[in-house]
Amino acid sequence: VSITKCSSDMNGYCLHGQCIYLVDMSQNYCRCEVGYTGVRCEHFFL
């Protein structure tokens, strides 16, 4: 799977995490910080 950083167009997309662009899947993906979950790392669960 080809991975790169998300474009500046997606700034602010991942609230508490790192935005990764999964090129082959045509998807942006949020890698959440510890304690956060949700598609956009918007939920704190600890």
Epitope: D9, N28, V39
Partner: antibody, heavy 116, light 106 residues
């Protein structure tokens, strides 16, 4: 199956306003950005702006600032494009487009005709 | 705002031939460019994203390349169904479409 269902065709008089809707099914709009795009056959595709439904933040192309207002209602999973002070230049097909979890998933488009 | 200059605005080519369309960005867009096909009465169809990544179901006759400010899109072995208008889209910083290229068959 993910879908973006746009409202039906509109015939509106010059000077009036119109509000177009884009209702998502199969996914939560809060997980995405919703973009709006204008298509006129001779002028081509133009990006109008976008909204982040999670917080309501919007971005517009300067050309459409004051002409277009993008809003979202997360309770109904719907995004809106309001166009004001309509002229013949606003006659076009308007598309809502989802980006974020999936690259650029388009609605079917709404035809807006401005005519007296 | 990033501007996208697409050329040519129209072109005519023979069946079985090859055409190339270019888009030049007003600044480096870091390969964040997509290419769309549009036919009258239909919605735009995504062909390629991230410069060269073909979407599922898109024939390998379509290809893209480039970096920095300069990008190109090619169709080889032209077929009648390729008659359409093609647009580039930068999505590095917000979004901007190119002006479009209308493709006709000789």
């Amino acid at each position: 199956e993910d879908q973006l269902q746009q409202s039906g065709a509109e015939l509106v008089k010059p000077g009036a306003s119109v509000k177009l809707s884009c209702t998502a099914s199969g996914f939560n709009i809060k997980d995405t950005y919703i973009q709006w795009v204008k298509l006129r056959p001779e002028q081509g595709l133009e990006w109008i702006g976008r909204i982040d439904p999670l917080n309501g933040n919007t971005k517009y192309v300067p050309k459409f600032q004051g002409k277009a207002t993008i809003t979202a209602d997360t309770s109904s999973n719907t995004a809106y494009l309001q166009l004001s002070s309509l002229t013949s230049e606003d006659t076009a097909v308007y598309y809502c487009v989802r980006s974020g979890t999936l690259f650029d998933f388009w609605g079917q488009g709404t035809t807006l005709t401005v005519s007296s | 705002d990033i501007q996208m200059t697409q050329s040519p605005s129209s072109l005519s080519a023979s069946l079985g031939g090859k055409v190339t369309i270019t888009c030049k960005a007003s600044q480096d867009i870091h390969k964040y460019i997509a290419w769309y096909q549009h036919k009258p009465g239909k919605g735009p169809r995504l062909l390629i994203q991230y410069t060269s990544t073909l979407q599922p179901g898109i024939p390998s006759r379509f290809s893209g390349s480039g970096s920095g400010r300069d990008y190109s899109f090619s169709i080889s072995n032209l077929e009648p169904e390729d008659i359409a208008t093609y647009y580039c889209l930068q999505y590095d910083n917000l979004r901007t479409f190119g002006g479009g290229t209308k493709l006709e068959i000789k």
